[in-house]
């Protein structure tokens, strides 16, 4: 066959779906690779063709669209499974072509099993809730397009293994789950099971997400530098190792980039000739407030180094702060015999 623009296997779109549930999968060509949509392609006389390679096989084969009850079907640029089976796992290819044009992309589809606590190999989206912030909601994800608005599905919510009912601060409200006041104890996996009828059949959609309760913007502050501070003086003799920790606390801020850096005499360590190393460690509180420690280390400090200005800087979306370390050269203690001799006026 003639040349085809092959975008290869799009592993960025590792699609996971649950066994025995409907799945609608859009051809990635129109989402990520081509500058036109399916309608434009269709009206220009292009045809969308689907085929697949089974798991652990090399042979590409056409998808069987003649299964009982139309278990697999195509509608515009969507491949439908009603429902999936475990052995549907494999690499799927959608190809757009006519006599003069051809473009195709493959993507992996994994059909996974879940247990009765909704545990599975599925990668879970994370939804962050602010601690003690008033009413917040999560919505049952990725259910759009499965049934028309005229259908009234049933929705059951679970936390871990348990159906949510009579929970103190968590209230199921259809597709939404409301948290009256989010607490650390609300951390966990939440599952919605959506059940709906279609053409005389009944289908379930199971969606699990992880809820993480994080620091509230109401309590957020600019970075706080705990070290260096005015109480600690780094007093060294030439030849000793100089270690100065910079420890900074950052309040949790959604999508904020937290940064810590040292300057030596106003320059970044990379821009000066001193043999300096910086090691960073990061720890998080239960509400994802962050503590970053950057330890500045000079193995054999010189008297010149001890005269320099060492400043720790920190920045977040809440602001920027800086603090200088107090560094000085240790004055060598006079030798004991000399001191005594001087005291007695000896020559």
């Amino acid at each position: 066959s003639e040349r085809c623009d092959d975008w290869g296997l799009d592993t960025m779109r590792q699609i996971q779906v649950f066994e025995d549930e409907p799945a609608r999968i859009k051809c990635p060509l129109f989402e990520h690779f081509l500058k036109f949509n399916y309608s434009t392609a269709h009206s220009a006389g292009l045809t969308l063709i689907w085929y697949w390679t089974r798991q652990d096989r090399d042979l590409e084969e056409p998808i069987n669209f003649r299964l009982p009850e139309n278990r697999i079907s195509k509608e515009k640029d969507v491949l439908w499974f009603r429902p999936t089976l475990l052995n549907d796992t494999g690499n799927y290819t959608c190809m757009l072509r006519n006599t003069t044009y051809c473009s195709k992309v493959a993507f992996p589809l994994e059909v996974v099993q879940k247990d009765s606590c909704f545990n599975s190999p599925m990668k879970l989206p994370v939804h962050k809730l602010y601690i003690e912030y008033g009413i917040q909601r999560i919505t049952c994800p990725n259910v759009d397009g499965y049934f028309p608005s005229s259908v009234k599905p049933t929705i059951t919510w679970y936390m871990g293994c348990y159906k949510i009912q009579n929970f103190n601060n968590v209230i199921p409200e259809g597709m939404n789950l409301s948290f009256l006041i989010a607490l650390i104890s609300n951390n966990g996996n939440y599952t919605c099971v959506v059940t709906y009828p279609e053409n005389g059949r009944t289908f379930h959609l199971t969606r699990t997400l992880t809820v993480k309760v994080v620091g509230s913007p109401k309590n957020a502050v600019p970075p706080v530098i705990h070290s260096p501070n005015d109480h600690v003086v780094y007093e060294k003799e030439p030849g000793e190792e100089l270690l100065i920790p910079c420890t900074v606390y950052f309040s949790f801020l959604m999508d904020s980039r937290n940064e810590v850096w040292w300057t030596i005499d106003g320059k970044k360590p990379d821009d000066i000739t001193i043999d300096v190393t910086i090691n960073e460690s990061i720890s998080h509180s239960r509400t994802e407030d962050e503590t970053r420690t950057q330890i500045l280390s000079i193995k054999k400090v010189t008297s010149e180094d001890l005269k320099r200005s060492y400043v720790c800087h920190a920045r977040s979306a809440k602001g920027e702060v800086a603090k200088a370390a107090k560094v000085k050269q240790k004055v060598p203690a006079p030798r004991y015999t000399v001191e005594l001799a001087c005291g007695f006026g000896a020559t």
Epitope: E19, D115, S116, C117, K152, T154, C161, V194, T195, T202
Partner: antibody, heavy 117, light 107 residues
Framework: QVKLHQSGAELAKPGASVKMSCKAS????????IHWVKQRPGQGLEWIGY????????EYNQKFTDKATLSADKSSSTAYMQLSSLTSEDSAVYYC??????????WGQGTLVTVSA | NIVMTQSPKSMSMSVGERVTLSCKAS??????VSWFQQKPDQSPKLLIY???NRYTGVPDRFTGSGSATDFTLTISTVQAEDLADYHC?????????FGGGTKLEIK
């Protein structure tokens, strides 16, 4: 296809115990909760409780907490219900039911328990 | 516990007639009501879930409606094979509870 096959009828004396089984086939046993429902002759249905085979957790109707014990054996895809200290009030048909998303969609054929001196 | 009350206890209808069965909950159960059909010497079968959704394979002569505390199962044109007991149940909050049932007889 999904099937729940329940053990045969039981005739028991007052004060005795019985343990009935519900063997699942046609699906992954570990993926669904199993509920138990009681039906006295000519009467309505009564929910006893459920067992979650993954966690082993069972939730009971308070009325049955001292009467029924629910369990499951994943290796044989079988759910069990034990009834203790039997009285004539326990004479009934007992059903196991597979549930998902609040749908009591698949029922066993029932186990008849008769308590008689 | 939520009490589910069904009415009437029994009714006798002719083939082709319209049948309306009632189920009332003692508290608001939203849409979390299911209807079950139980033919003589058989297990119950799910007919309706979520108050109004027909389960797989259920003929469209069966229609569920209602919300909160008042629910109805309607058989638009009753057939001889519809002879059965009909149970409603709330699947809203533990303990799940069922009505006493309505026995439908065919004249």
């Amino acid at each position: 296809q999904v099937k729940l096959h329940q053990s045969g009828a039981e005739l028991a004396k007052p004060g005795a115990s019985v343990k009935m089984s519900c063997k699942a086939s046609g699906y992954t046993f570990n993926s669904y909760w199993i509920h138990w429902v009681k039906q006295r002759p000519g009467q309505g249905l009564e929910w006893i409780g459920y067992n979650n085979p993954t966690s082993g957790y069972s939730e009971y109707n308070q009325k049955f907490t001292d009467k029924a014990t629910l369990s499951a054996d994943k290796s044989s895809s079988t759910a069990y219900m034990q009834l203790s200290s039997l009285t004539s009030e326990d004479s009934a048909v007992y059903y196991c039911v597979r549930e998902y998303g609040d749908l009591f969609a698949y029922w066993g054929q029932g186990t008849l328990v008769t308590v008689s001196a | 516990n939520i009490v589910m009350t069904q009415s009437p206890k029994s009714m006798s209808m002719s083939v082709g007639e319209r049948v309306t069965l009632s189920c009332k909950a003692s508290e608001n159960v939203g849409y979390s009501v299911s209807w079950f059909q139980q033919k003589p010497d058989q297990s119950p079968k799910l007919l309706i879930y979520g108050a109004s959704n027909r389960y797989t394979g259920v003929p469209d002569r069966f229609t569920g409606s209602g919300s909160a505390t008042d629910f109805t199962l309607t058989i638009s044109t009753v057939q001889a094979e519809d002879l059965a007991d009909y149970h409603c149940g709330q699947i809203y909050i533990y303990p799940y509870t069922f009505g006493g049932g309505t026995k439908l007889e065919i004249k």
